[in-house]
């Protein structure tokens, strides 16, 4: 009955942790004697491919000092602890503890047997690191050129992570990599660009990470943050403003970032009606007069500009009975 | 502790047949393979064959296959080794040895002189 | 059968030299390699297993390397108990094949 090694083709392990190579000789055959098992790594310098054997009598040898005997050990083969006791190497499963990146490789695991000879089996062993990501907002001004608004970095992950970002902006993505403090590791970071405007404040935008030590992608939600100077509209018009009318209000409606510091009521002819009385953002009316036959000006200021907004107005003699009730900026 | 003694010297002639005992003691016999390995005089070591005394299993060189027959007794915990038609060429010290790991364990060897 | 062919055949050295004495397998055995001493008279001693390990007890001049096909026996400082005849073994085919040997003798 022929014999085989049953080894996994491939085994992930963390960077620093434990990771377990399993080697097993079967089927279990009566009269099969193991003489001995060894582990070996075919692509490592000359005087670092053996990594441990297990003499039934001896016990385990690891003479390598990489990994090195404080970082090895045999998960269950057994020596025999007298000449009445069989050893156990049936199960020759190789514990790496501490894993570091040099770590990373083929693994043969081999069976000296009488009568069959030598059988063996080989393991590509991976060493990962799991990231560790963080994403945050960069505060910035508008302006007529990209720049980047949103920051997403996985830092030491073992290979690289993916980042990606979900977004309805017009955006684009740029990322760089560099080593890690971890040998062997790569941070990489990717920043989120648009032409920052108005439009982009307050708007999230998801950063994606994939890394195959993650069990689904993380996704790390980022609300953008743009200074920008106010945009203005101003509401409370109605096109009903008659002679004599004393419920009218306009309103200086304002988005921008940060806050509006000032509001400023003026008209284009220069001529400022004295029954209209400019309370911050809003103009209280009064009585409507025809001076009120003018266009209307907020000017809003805040840290980074002025905005600003025109309403022309229209003076009826008597109340549009048609269109009343109805409002208009 | 383990022990494999053999049987003494013998004196042979040609065309004959010898057998070689080994008395094992100090392990469970039926455990091991015994491994059967000889010396011509000045010269170098050559494995015969083995036997599994737990199931009576053998397992030849192919080059005395036709000529030696190996075989355990449980209940003396011994092992023999026949070897029929003798020649000169057959004069050796003839060593039992139990592999563990390597040949760790070995008989003090016996003498066969075949002469005519 | 695998040919383990060992050489020198004799070799003659002074207490303190390092000698080496190597073995050639006619097809790749891995590291399935056993040195032996065999002292006059006596049946022989395991001094290496898997081409490189050191057996327990066997002093650390002994070393053992190679893999594949070429296996080396170094003795760093030749002491006079080194008297001897080496042989190396295979144990990856089945019939495991020595080398024809190498007498040591001390000068």
């Known amino acids: 009955q022929d014999v085989r090694v049953q080894v996994l083709p491939e085994v992930r392990g963390q960077l620093g942790g434990t990771v377990e190579l399993p080697c097993h000789l079967l089927p279990p055959v009566p009269g099969l004697y193991i003489s001995l098992v060894t582990w070996q790594r075919p692509d490592a310098p000359a005087n670092h491919q053996n990594v441990a054997a297990f003499h039934p009598k001896m016990g385990p040898s690891f003479p390598s000092p990489k990994p090195g005997s404080e970082r090895l050990s045999f998960v269950s083969a057994k020596q025999s602890t007298g000449q009445d006791t069989e050893a156990e190497l049936q199960d020759a499963t190789l514990a790496l503890h501490g894993l570091t990146v040099e770590d990373e490789g083929n693994y043969t695991c081999e069976f000296a047997t009488f009568p069959k000879g030598s059988v063996r089996g080989m393991t590509w062993l991976r060493v990962i690191a799991k990231p560790k990501n963080q994403a945050e907002a960069q505060k910035v001004t508008f302006s007529q050129d990209p720049t980047t608004v949103a920051l997403c970095i996985s830092k030491e992950g073992r290979p690289p992570a993916r980042i990606s970002w979900l977004s309805s902006l017009d955006w684009e993505a740029k990322e760089t990599q560099v080593s890690g403090t971890l040998a062997g590791t790569v941070t990489v970071t990717s920043r989120f660009t648009l032409v920052p405007s108005g439009r982009a404040d307050g708007v999230t935008v998801t950063c994606k990470v994939e890394h195959e030590s993650f069990e689904e992608p993380a996704l790390i939600p980022v609300t953008l943050s743009v200074r920008y100077p106010p945009e203005v509209s101003i509401s409370g018009y109605d096109d009903n403003w008659y002679l004599g009318r004393t419920d009218a209000t306009l309103s200086c409606d304002v988005r921008s970032n940060p806050e509006p510091t000032g509001y400023d009521w003026s008209t284009t002819s220069g001529t400022f009606p004295t029954s209209a009385v400019a309370q911050g953002s809003q103009l209280v009316i009064h009585a409507v007069d025809s001076l009120f036959n003018t266009t209307f000006v907020c000017t809003v200021t805040n840290a980074v500009g002025m905005g600003r907004a025109e309403q022309v107005i229209f003076v009826r003699e008597t109340p549009n009975t048609a269109g009343a009730g109805a409002t208009g900026g | 502790e383990v022990q494999l003694v053999q049987s003494g010297t013998e004196l042979k002639k040609p065309g004959s047949s010898v057998k070689v005992s080994c008395k094992a003691s100090?392990?469970?016999?039926?455990?091991?393979?015994i491994h059967w390995v000889r010396q011509p005089p000045g010269k170098g070591l050559e494995w015969i064959g083995a036997?599994?005394?737990?199931?009576?299993?053998?397992n030849y060189n192919q080059k005395f296959k036709a000529r030696a027959t190996i075989t355990a007794v449980t209940s003396t915990s011994t092992a023999y080794m026949e070897l029929s038609s003798l020649t000169s060429e057959d004069s050796a010290v003839y060593y039992c040895?139990?592999?563990?790991?390597?040949?760790?364990?070995w008989g003090q060897g016996t003498t066969v002189t075949v002469s005519s | 059968d695998i040919v383990m062919t060992q050489s020198p055949s004799f070799l003659s050295a002074s207490v303190g030299d390092r000698v080496s004495v190597t073995c050639k397998a006619s097809?790749?055995?891995?590291?399935?390699v056993v040195w032996y001493q065999q002292r006059a008279g006596q049946p022989p001693k395991t001094l290496i297993y898997?081409?490189?390990y050191r057996y327990s007890g066997v002093p650390d001049r002994f070393t053992g390397s190679g893999s594949g096909t070429d296996f080396t026996l170094t003795i760093s400082s030749l002491q006079s108990e080194d008297l001897a005849e080496y042989f190396c073994?295979?144990?990856?085919?089945?019939?495991?094949?020595f080398g024809q040997g190498t007498k040591l003798e001390i000068k």
């Open positions: 036997v599994y005394p737990g199931n009576s299993d053998s």
């Open positions: 040895t139990k592999l563990v790991g390597t040949f760790d364990y």
């Open positions: 073994q295979q144990y990856n085919t089945n019939p495991f094949t």
């Open positions: 898997s081409a490189s």
């Open positions: 100090g392990y469970i016999f039926t455990s091991y393979w």
């Open positions: 097809q790749n055995v891995g590291i399935n």
